[in-house]
Structure formats: structure tokens, C-alpha cells
Amino acid sequence: MCDAFVGTWKLVSSENFDDYMKEVGVGFATRKVAGMAKPNMIISVNGDVITIKSESTFKNTEISFILGQEFDEVTADDRKVKSTITLDGGVLVHVQKWDGKSTTIKRKREDDKLVVECVMKGVTSTRVYERA
């Protein structure tokens, strides 16, 4: 089922990302640089292990995980979080927890695009990727 996500994706649009980062608690300086970045996302699968890489002028990150198993993640904005990613109806649901806070990132395929929906409390950001 994750095969639909495999490949290299480039960011083509971003909506409400600064407001989302503010709600997460990201400082101004980090928000500014992160908001300007146009990351490529590279997703691969090897057996049970899924790898998601993000590459940009801001920061390069990589996570490798097994669905449903909690793992440690250092986010691009430098949060040290506990993450769990599950597959729910074809949607990769990524929950990050840190400092008593929680945010959810949903990755889903829509037509030929990969849509990433970031939710923190009542604030939602939608970022759309196309195949590179």
C-alpha cells in the first residue's frame, strides 16, 4: 500500500505553513528560514522499513520506521520528538509528541500529487508535492 508514496517529490505549494509553525511553537528565526525552503521529499520502502528523506537548503532530515512502532525523530525545525506513523485508509498518519504537545502530519496521494496536511490544535497547513 505504501508503494504509491515511493519516489522523489518536490514541493509546489504551501498554505498556512507559518501559522502552523507558530502554533507548534517554532521561533521566528527558524520559521523564516523553514518557510522559504522548497524541500524535496524522497520516500523509499525496504521490506517493513519505510524511509522518508527531506532535502532542502534549510535542513536535510531522514527518518526510517516501521508502521505502528514509536521512534525518535529530530525534526527539521530541531524538535526532539517521539513519533509514530500508521497507515489509515491509504493515508500515512504521523503523530509527533514533545514537551507535552502533539501534532499530526497526514500524507496522502491525490491524483498525481502527494498532499501533506499538518495539524496543530486548530491550525492546519496544506503542502502539495509533485513528482520531481
Epitope: 511553537g25 517554532v26 521566528f28 527558524t30 523564516k32 528560514v33 522559504m36 537548503t57 525545525d77 530541531d78
Partner: antibody, heavy 119, light 108 residues
Framework: QVQLQQPGAELVKPGASVKLSCKAS????????ITWVKQRPGQGLEWIGD????????TNNEKFKSKATLTVDTSSSTAYMQLSSLTSEDSAVYYC????????????WGQGTTLTVSS | EVVLTQSPALMAASPGEKVTITCSVS???????LHWYQQKSETSPKPWIY???NLASGVPVRFSGSGSGTSYSLTISSMEAEDAATYYC?????????FGAGTKLELK
Amino acid sequence: QVQLQQPGAELVKPGASVKLSCKASGYTFTSNAITWVKQRPGQGLEWIGDISPGSGSTTNNEKFKSKATLTVDTSSSTAYMQLSSLTSEDSAVYYCARLRGYYDYFDFWGQGTTLTVSS
Amino acid sequence: EVVLTQSPALMAASPGEKVTITCSVSSSISSSNLHWYQQKSETSPKPWIYGTSNLASGVPVRFSGSGSGTSYSLTISSMEAEDAATYYCQQASHYPLTFGAGTKLELK
């Protein structure tokens, strides 16, 4: 260990310019922004601006926009701040500091460069 | 710009005394972005508390931080001689980043 090395002092004449340096070591230079802070004798701290070495992106406090120019040389892991049209008001200690992402606090500081503007 | 008002500006405390320094912020900020620094004479500021309540490396556990929204504080549970210094609060939520004017803490 993380270190930010700054020259101890600079003496320059009014109207001149000066380029202050901040050499970073002990971490990946392009991973964290470098910020600059001014402290006049006996006074508090003022944020001048910051630069992200990975992208070269800068943000200046409006108050210092025409005064300070921030640059980096990634090959030598050094950040620079050029101060122009110097007056006695620019006499101060200038610190560089590393910005720790997310929280955006200054987790490592240089020793500071004491700039004296005098004829 | 966001103004940080520290109080008191100057205070003296005896060894063993509890000390509280407050930082009032002119508009609400994320608690993740309120920080405290300690500075002693002729030396660089040191990160002391970040994200309102996280102690920086090497900071004694007698220090603590709390607050949210527009009201924050730094507390020393039992004053020691080495705590005499100037403490600055700083916000990183909004442009430009700003500092409080500082609280000078002296040993009585």
C-alpha cells in the same frame, strides 16, 4: 565541543567601517543560524540580526538595517558582520551566538569583540 | 516590537533566600520561545533557561522557570553566592527578537 571565536578588540575611526569575525567549530556550521547581539557599556542586550549559513538568508533588526551587513564563509566556518559609517554610538561589545532551532535560543556565545570608535 | 519588562531591575538576596524575577511580555508569545540568560561582569551571557522551563546544560536544579502567554518568571529556590549576576529574559516568537532590560541580582 562547540566554540565561537571572536577577536578581543577593534579600534576604528569615526566614519570608517569594520568587519567583525566569528569562527565556529565543533559542529556542522551550516546546521544552525548565527546571530549577532550588541551590548553597550553598562547596558542591556540588543539583537542585531541573524544569518543562516546553509542558505545565506539573513534577517536584520530594522534598527540595524543600514548599519550591519551579515555574511558567512562556509569554507572556513566563519560568520562576519560589517558595520559601516561608525560613530561613538557603535562603541560596544558585539557577540555572535549560535541559534538553536525550534526554541530559537542562543545556546553558545562567542567571547565578544569590544569595538571602540574613536579618533 | 514585543517589549519585555523585567522586575525588579535590582535586588539583593541573602544566602538561602528564595528569589523570583518576573518578565512581563507586551503581547502573548509561545512558551517555547521565552528564554533566560545569566551574565556576570565582563563575560558573555550564558543560556540559563530555555522554552520557559528547560534548564540549560550545567544550570543548578535550584533554578526553575514558569509562565505562559504574557507572564513569565525565573525562580531560585535557595540563593547561593554564585547566583549573583544579571539575568535577562528574551523572546523569540516575533520579529524583532527582543530582550528585557535585565535584573541585577546581588548577594546581601
